[in-house]
């Protein structure tokens, strides 16, 4: 047999469905099994209650990605193996990684007092996450447009040059990735 469609790396959120593709050709038609980190993967063919289904095509379908604080049964490196009595073919490795976004910010912004006309800098480090979270800022619950020439956002820093009285307010840093969004504690610019 030979593998004609190899599985691809995937990053997926906990609780979401996903599929690792695999297609094989051969005569006689090969059977397909999946292995994760070297251990055979149980599917609905072994246990009807399984959250993993072996599709007729040979792909592995996850009804929902299961991922706990400690047990992470779906995360790992997968291969599909196609077999018939003439031999076997092994696919390329595909990693299944579970997206993550923690709640706690590595650095919350702190209150800043600045004189009008002076620059102001607010700093933030988003929560740990996978993929690595990006950030944006809100002022008084409204997203800040960083296209305004006085405002620049680089890394975790919000820099306002030549501050005005109208810049005063409550600033919140928002960390975001495919899992969702997390709001920092607000910081007051006075």
């Amino acid at each position: 047999p030979r593998i004609v469609e190899h599985p691809s790396d995937v990053i997926v959120s906990k609780g979401e469905p996903t599929t690792l593709n695999c297609k094989a050709e051969g005569r006689p038609t090969p059977t397909i099994e999946w292995y994760k980190d070297g251990e055979r993967v149980e599917t609905d063919k072994d246990d009807p209650r399984s959250h993993r289904m072996l599709l007729p095509s040979g792909s592995l379908f996850f009804l929902r990605i299961v991922h706990g604080r400690r047990s992470k049964p779906d995360e790992g490196s997968y291969v599909c193996v196609a077999r018939n009595y003439l031999g076997e073919a092994v696919s390329r490795n595909a990693s299944l990684e579970v997206a993550l976004l923690r709640d706690d910010f590595r650095q919350n912004p702190t209150d800043v007092v600045v004189a009008a006309g002076e620059p102001a800098i607010l700093e933030c480090q988003p929560p740990r996450g996978h993929p690595e979270p990006t950030i944006y800022w809100k002022k008084d619950k409204v997203r800040i447009d960083d296209k305004e020439e006085r405002i620049s956002i680089r890394g975790g820093k919000l820099m306002i040059s030549n501050t005005r009285k109208s810049d005063a307010g409550m600033y919140t840093c928002v960390g975001t990735n495919m899992v969702g969004e997390r709001d920092s504690d607000p910081a007051e610019l006075t």
Epitope: D37, E39, G68, R69, S71
Partner: antibody, heavy 118, light 105 residues
Framework: EVQLVQSGAEVKKPGASVKVSCKAS????????MHWVRQAPGQGLEWMGW????????NFPQKFQGRVTMTRDTSITTAYMDLSRLRSDDTAVYYC???????????WGQGTMVTVSS | DIVMTQSPSSLSASVGDRVTITCRAS??????LNWYQQKPGKAPKLLIY???SLQSGVPSRFSGSGSGTDFTLTISSLQPEDFATYYC???????FGGGTKVEIK
Amino acid sequence: EVQLVQSGAEVKKPGASVKVSCKASGYTFTGYYMHWVRQAPGQGLEWMGWINPNSGATNFPQKFQGRVTMTRDTSITTAYMDLSRLRSDDTAVYYCARESGDDAFDIWGQGTMVTVSS
Amino acid sequence: DIVMTQSPSSLSASVGDRVTITCRASQSISSYLNWYQQKPGKAPKLLIYAASSLQSGVPSRFSGSGSGTDFTLTISSLQPEDFATYYCQQSVGLFFGGGTKVEIK
């Protein structure tokens, strides 16, 4: 069928050690943490620690540190719990339990009675 | 360590009664709380995980609620097979509550 099957009852003298086994079947052994929980006669459930079958890493509450050892053999999908320097108050039913991806003990062994008596 | 306090330690009830068991954590555990049922001579059985999610195969008369430090297990209409001991467990540090024995009145 997903199940955990434990070794049989043991009778031990004070100061001895006991090793209880837990054979897992019907699921990917290395994907789920294995825990040990004990229950003295007429008492509640007491968590003893966990082993990550993938890495072999372990964690125990302070009460059991230095006296309990948890190991696994992935080739036969079996976890082991070794308790040393046994005392009479270690008399209990010892359970292994699988921790699901929902952070709960969804599959339990049938229990192993360990009696410590002189 | 986070200490889990269950109350009451025992209660008497009749078939058809609504039964409520509470569990209090010594500090916030968000929704990391599970409930188990144990019958004499048997291993515990998972009923509720993540404070309010019903484990597959468990009758819908069992429900869980709460978050933070205060949690409740409710049996809406007690059945003869529900007479057992119930344990809460926090899944951060994994310790169990002391148990609640539900007996026939």
